[in-house]
Structure formats: structure tokens, C-alpha cells
């Protein structure tokens, strides 16, 4: 029997290497059965996750999954950091793993580095 618990499909220790000035969509895949839960995004500040208010978000529906999307229009250097989505379901809070955005400022990089370089050259990243 398929579980009817809400599940949030963000991989543990996932990350995205992105560039300041570009648009970016951060997706939180949500599985639910009958009623779509209320989902929010927060950004980690140490051990506290600060809810993101007044940001552009949207839903995208696919066959077996819905996606709660946080829009970056455009990405700013200050968007660097870790994010988590949470679902409010039957008065319980379900939290996703955090996912990290590594933002490169294209002004300080002569050319866009590869994904592998992004992971291995932290001096290119904002901390």
C-alpha cells in the first residue's frame, strides 16, 4: 500500500552551482495524496532556518509530483547559502533536506567555471 504521508524529495547534500545575474528556479518536489499541503521555503542562518517572506513562488504540477518553486529573478550574490522547504500537513511540519546554492559572481570570474571546478574551488564562491 502506497504511503499517503507528504514527502519532500530534495536530496541530502545536494547543491546547485549558479551565477549572479542569471534567473534560477529552486524546486521542492512534493508528493501528496488528497490535499496539497501548504509549503514554504526558508534559508539557513546557522542552525536556524529563516522563513522567506514576500518572495516569488509558484507551483508546477506533473503526473505524480508537484513542485513548489522559489524564483530568483535574478540571482544575487547574497542568495548564496542553504535552503530548505517545509510542508504543513495535518498540523505536522515535514522538513526537507537542505540544498545549497553556490553563487559565482561573474564579475570576479573571467570565465564561467565548470560544475567540478565550482565544487573544488571554494574561493570562487561567496561564503
Amino acid at each position: 500500500k502506497e504511503s499517503c504521508d507528504v514527502q519532500l524529495y530534495i536530496k541530502r547534500q545536494s547543491y546547485h552551482s549558479i551565477f549572479a545575474g542569471d534567473p534560477f528556479k529552486l524546486e521542492c518536489p512534493v508528493k501528496y495524496c488528497a490535499h496539497r499541503p501548504q509549503v514554504t521555503w526558508c534559508k539557513l542562518n546557522g542552525t536556524t532556518c529563516v522563513k522567506l517572506e514576500g518572495r516569488h513562488t509558484s507551483w508546477k504540477q506533473e503526473k505524480n509530483l508537484s513542485f513548489f518553486i522559489l524564483h530568483f529573478e535574478p540571482v544575487l550574490p547574497s542568495d548564496n547559502g542553504s535552503y530548505r522547504c517545509s510542508a504543513n500537513f495535518l498540523s505536522a511540519i515535514i522538513e526537507s533536506h537542505s540544498t545549497t546554492l553556490y553563487v559565482t559572481d561573474v564579475k570576479s570570474a573571467s570565465e564561467r567555471p565548470s560544475k567540478d571546478e565550482m565544487a573544488s574551488r571554494p574561493w570562487l564562491l561567496y561564503s
Epitope: 536530496k11 541530502r12 547534500q13 546547485h16 552551482s17 533536506h97 537542505s98 560544475k115
Partner: antibody, heavy 119, light 112 residues
């Protein structure tokens, strides 16, 4: 049932390159992380690196950076390990493994493929 | 890198014995989500390793209940409550909290 089959091992001369393949079945690899571990004869386990097949992002142990490249083809459910500038000390059984990226609910290893670096 | 130190390196025991293997990490394995990503593997000669335990104490499906894991922070143990003939193998701990992933050097469990 999740299963992995490795291929591509064998005898290779020092200084040459080799590409190992790891074919997964029973799982959508985009929901997983796939990683490579090696074991020299009679020795312990050494983590080479991993890939997120959903986006191609990789992580490596420092000693393998620049010499090892892990890649994946989600549509074919295959992960690859390319090793360049092989040395005799790279002789080992190379294992690929896969685990659930969301809940760690499974972690399955392939049978391993022996790479012998010798002239 | 996190160093993983297992003890003992080898161990002789008899069928029916209770056996404990310890694993110590050079820094805490407690992740930001409050979980410790410590795994135990079993490897038999000529075979691939097989995960027995993950998240310190969760048993993989099909693993007999005589295996158990415990610990927190930097100190972890694998216990086999009553050794069976098929349990003679090499056991490895490894951490999945930080990159790069690192393994203990292994504990070879032999028949006395």
C-alpha cells in the same frame, strides 16, 4: 530489486587511461547518488567520489581530483569512472555503489571490477 | 578529512559468542539535521561489501536482528549478539556526514 553491474576492468599499462562503467537496474538513478570505491589487494576501502545523476554534480576525495572523472547518463542508467595517468598503485578492485539520495533507504554495491596496472 | 579508527583490527571468536567492534571518528558525525551518518559494512572474501547498518542503528532489510549498532558523536559500536558461522567476515565502519567519505581500516572477525 536494485542491482549494479560493473565492466571495463582489466590489464592496463602505466600512464594510460581506463573508463569503467556501472549499469544500474531496478531504480531511477536520478533519485540516487552513485559513487565509486576502490580496494587494493589485501587492503581496506577507499572512497573515490560520487555523482548526482540528476544534474551531474560531483564530489571527489582530494587525491583523485584531476585524475578521476565520474560521469553519468541518466537515460541509460549508467555511471562511469574515468581514470587517467594510471600508476601501478592504482591496481585495485573498483566498486560502484548506489544509494537513495532522499532517505538513505538502500545502499547497493556492484560486484567490483579488477583493474591491474602493469607494464 | 575525518579519520575513522576501528578496534580491534582482528578478532577471534566462537559461534555463539557476543562480539563488539568499536569505531571512533576524529570529529563528530552529527549532521545539521540532527542525524549521525555512520554506516557498517560486511565484506566476505572475494565479495563486494554489503551495508548492514545505517544512521548508526538502522538495520538494512534482510539483516538478522542479532546485529545492532549504537553510539553518538564520535564513538560507535557494532554488536553481534550471538555469532553465526556466516558472520565471519571483515567489518568496516564509514561516515557519510562530511566529504570526502572515509572508512575505518576494517576489523577481521575470525573463527577461534
Amino acid at each position: 530489486e536494485v542491482q549494479l553491474v560493473e565492466s571495463g576492468g582489466g590489464l592496463v599499462q602505466p600512464g594510460r587511461s581506463l573508463r569503467l562503467s556501472c549499469t544500474a537496474s531496478g531504480v531511477n538513478i536520478k533519485d540516487t547518488y552513485m559513487y565509486w570505491v576502490r580496494q587494493a589487494p589485501g587492503k581496506g576501502l577507499e572512497w573515490v567520489g560520487r555523482i548526482d545523476p540528476a544534474n551531474g554534480y560531483t564530489r571527489y576525495t582530494a587525491s583523485f581530483k584531476g585524475r578521476a572523472t565520474i560521469s553519468a547518463d541518466g537515460s541509460k542508467s549508467i555511471a562511469y569512472l574515468q581514470m587517467n595517468s594510471l600508476k601501478t598503485e592504482d591496481t585495485a578492485v573498483y566498486y560502484c555503489a548506489v544509494y537513495d539520495g532522499y532517505y538513505e533507504s538502500f545502499d547497493v554495491w556492484g560486484q567490483g571490477t579488477l583493474v591491474t596496472v602493469s607494464s | 578529512d575525518i579519520q575513522m579508527t576501528q578496534s580491534p583490527s582482528s578478532l577471534s571468536a566462537s559461534v555463539g559468542d557476543r562480539v563488539t567492534i568499536t569505531c571512533r571518528s576524529s570529529q563528530s558525525l552529527l549532521d545539521s539535521d540532527g542525524k549521525s551518518y555512520l554506516n557498517w559494512l560486511q565484506q566476505k572474501p572475494g565479495k563486494a561489501p554489503k551495508r548492514l547498518i545505517y544512521l548508526v542503528s538502522k538495520l538494512d532489510s534482510g539483516v538478522p536482528s542479532r546485529f545492532s549498532g549504537s553510539g553518538s558523536g564520535t564513538d560507535f559500536t557494532l554488536t553481534i549478539s550471538s555469532l553465526q558461522p556466516e558472520d565471519f567476515a571483515t567489518y568496516y565502519c564509514w561516515q557519510g556526514t562530511l566529504f570526502p567519505r572515509t572508512f575505518g581500516q576494517g576489523t577481521k572477525l575470525e573463527i577461534k
